[in-house]
Amino acid sequence: TQNKALPENIKYGIVLDAGSSHTSLYIYKWPAEKENDTGVVHQVEECRVKGPGISKYVQKVNEIGIYLTDCMERAREVIPRSQHQETPVYLGATAGMRLLRMESEELADRVLDVVERSLSNYPFDFQGARIITGQEEGAYGWITINYLLGKFSQKTRWFSIVPYETNNQETFGALDLGGASTQITFVPQNQTTESPDNALQFRLYGKDYNVYTHSFLCYGKDQALWQKLAKDIQVASNEILRDPCFHPGYKKVVNVSDLYKTPCTKRFEMTLPFQQFEIQGIGNYQQCHQSVLELFNTSYCPYSQCAFNGIFLPPLQGDFGAFSAFYFVMNFLNLTSEKVSQEKVTEMMKKFCSQPWEEIKTSYAGVKEKYLSEYCFSGTYILSLLLQGYHFTADSWEHIHFIGKIQGSDAGWTLGYMLNLTNMIPAEQPLSTPLSHSTYV
C-alpha cells in the first residue's frame, strides 16, 4: 500500500489588535510538536473588523458585541471545530485605549469589560483583553519580525527567506507606526544604556539580547496630524487654515471641539474666536515638512543623544523593518522599493503633495477620500520622523526595509504577543526532535 502521511497535530491561536483606528483579528497556526522551533508559526487569516477602534465605542459599548461578530464568526469557520476549545484568544489594545485611559480609567475599563464579556461568549479559550504598554508593543513587534526572519534560529540556512534577509544572525530593528503612537526598537551596539526605562533584556533560544525600545504616544500618524492642526490654528488669523500638508484645492471643515478632544492636543489648546475652521490645501512638501518638525522638541536632551522630546536614543545600528502604517503609506506612494534612495523619496513626495486634489481624486478613484487626502501629510510625517526624529540619514536610509508581510504573516506586535503568552519562545535553544512533523507509515 502507498505511504500515507499521518494527519498533522495542528494548533491555532487568535490575537485581536485593537488599534486606535480599527481592530484586526489574526489567526495563527503551527504544528504542535514543533511549537518551540523558530519560524514555524504562521498567519492563516487576517480579518479586519468593520468600524473604528474600540476606544470610539465609549458611549455605545452595547454595540461592541455586534462589532466583533463577523470576525469572530470567521475564526469559527477557519479553525476546525475540534480545536475551538483549546484555541487561545487574546485581545491587546494599544495607544487609542491608552489615550482613553488617560481621559477616564472608568470608561476604558468599561470598554474592556464589555469586550471581555463579548469574547467570552465564543467557544474558544479566551485569555483576556488588556491595554498593552508602549514598551510591550515595541518589544513584541521586534520579536515578530525577527522570529519571521529566522534571526533566532541557530541553524544557518543556505537559502534566503525574504529578499533582504542576510544569513547573519544580526537582528533587525523594528519601526512601527500606528494611528496614535509609534515605536522604535533595536539592539544597539553599546550594551550599556543611559536610560533604564528604554532597556529590555531577553534570553531567546539560548541567546541574550539587550534591546532599546521607546513608544512615542501621540506620535502615530493620526494623532500627529491633530497635533499639527492644533499647533497651526493657533497662529491662523481667521477660520481659514492654509495647510501645506494637503493637496492644492482640497477643502475640509474641522470642528474645534474635535481638535481638542484628544489629550494629544492639550499642549496647543487655546480659546479660539470660532467653533469651526476650514483647511485649505496648498500642497507644499517643504512647508509641510517644516510644520511637522515643530512637533519634535529637539532643543532639550538630558542624554548623550536623543530622538526628540528629551527621549534617549542610542546610535542606530543595523537594518530596520518598518511596518504597519510605515508600510501602508509608503506602499500606497509606491516608495517601498529597496532601490529608492531617500533623496528620490523626498523628490517624489514633493511631486505628490503638489498635485491638485481634483487630479488626485481622479487618479485614485477607488480610495476613500478621507484616507486619500492624508497621504501627503502621512508621507511627509514618515520622512520627518525617520530623518529628524530618529536621525536616519541619506546613507542609513538604505537600511530601512518597508515590510508588509514576512512569509505571509503580517509584521506587527500580535505574533510576538501570542508567542510570548503561549510560551512558544523558549529561553534556551530546544533540543532538536528526531522526527519531522510529517511521519510516514
Epitope: 470610539k56 455605545k60 452595547n62 470608561l107
Partner: antibody
Framework: QIQLVQSGPELKKPGETVKISCKAS????????MNWVKQAPGKGLKWMGW????????TYADDFKGRFAFSLETSASTAYLQINNLKNEDTATYFC??????????????WGQGTSVTVSS | DIVMTQSQKFMSTSVGDRVSVTCKAS??????VAWYQQKPGQSPKALIY???YRYSGVPGRFTGSGSGTDFTLTISNVQSEDLAEYFC?????????FGGGTKLEIK
C-alpha cells in the same frame, strides 16, 4: 450635583429656525451621550435621537431626519437642538436627557427642564 | 418600531393603596425597559431601569418587574406626591420608544 439646564421658551413663525441649548454640569460632559425627546401638548414622549459627545456621531430617529440637527459645544459642555423650516406640528416641549450606562445598556437618567417651542403664524 | 402599550390611560387609587401600572411591548425587549414619572409642568424623572432596578434616591415603594414583552411598575403604599403620569420606555432597539403614559389620580 448633576444638572441639565435648557434655554428658555421660544415663539416662532412657520419657516423659521430655532436653536435650543442644553448646558450640562456636575459631570464630565464628553463621557455621556445626550438624547433629545419631544413632547407635544397633551401627548406622550417621542425619542428624537442622540449625539455622541465623545465622537460627535449623530443618531436620528426616522421621523427626525432632515430638518433636525444636533450639535455640540464641548468647551461649554453644551448640546444643541436646531429645528429648521419650522412647522406647526413642531409645537412641543423638547427635553435633553443624559445617556448613561447602567447594567449593560444605556438609559436616560437625568433630564433637562424642557424648552417649550410654539410655532404659530 | 417597537410599540409600547400602556392600556390604562388613567388609574385611580387612594393614599396607602398598592397600584400596578402595566406596559406591553410589541416585541421581546429583554429587560431593557425603564419607567419614568412626570408631574404636571415638570420633566420626566427616572425611577426604574433594566425592568426592575431602582435608581438611587427613588423610594423603595416603587418596584419594577417583568421581561420579554410584559412589564409592571408597582407602587405600594401610594403617597399623595405620587400623583403623576408614568411612562414605560424600551431602549432595546432603535428607535427607542415610550408608552402612551398612565395618569395616576389620587381619590
Amino acid at each position: 450635583q448633576i444638572q441639565l439646564v435648557q434655554s428658555g421658551p421660544e415663539l416662532k413663525k412657520p419657516g423659521e429656525t430655532v436653536k435650543i441649548s442644553c448646558k450640562a454640569s456636575g459631570y464630565t460632559f464628553t463621557h455621556y451621550g445626550m438624547n433629545w425627546v419631544k413632547q407635544a401638548p397633551g401627548k406622550g414622549l417621542k425619542w428624537m435621537g442622540w449625539i455622541n459627545t465623545y465622537t460627535g456621531e449623530l443618531t436620528y430617529a426616522d421621523d427626525f431626519k432632515g430638518r433636525f440637527a444636533f450639535s455640540l459645544e464641548t468647551s461649554a459642555s453644551t448640546a444643541y437642538l436646531q429645528i429648521n423650516n419650522l412647522k406647526n406640528e413642531d409645537t412641543a416641549t423638547y427635553f435633553c436627557a443624559r445617556r448613561a450606562y447602567y447594567r449593560y445598556d444605556y438609559v436616560m437618567d437625568y433630564w433637562g427642564q424642557g424648552t417649550s417651542v410654539t410655532v404659530s403664524s | 418600531d417597537i410599540v409600547m402599550t400602556q392600556s390604562q390611560k388613567f388609574m385611580s387609587t387612594s393614599v396607602g393603596d398598592r397600584v400596578s401600572v402595566t406596559c406591553k411591548a410589541s416585541h421581546n425587549v429583554g429587560t431593557n425597559v425603564a419607567w419614568y414619572q412626570q408631574k404636571p409642568g415638570q420633566s420626566p424623572k427616572a425611577l426604574i431601569y433594566s425592568a426592575s432596578y431602582r435608581y438611587s434616591g427613588v423610594p423603595g415603594r416603587f418596584t419594577g418587574s417583568g421581561s420579554g414583552t410584559d412589564f409592571t411598575l408597582t407602587i405600594s403604599n401610594v403617597q399623595s406626591e405620587d400623583l403623576a403620569e408614568y411612562f414605560c420606555h424600551q431602549y432595546n432597539n432603535y428607535p427607542y420608544t415610550f408608552g402612551g403614559g398612565t395618569k395616576l389620580e389620587i381619590k
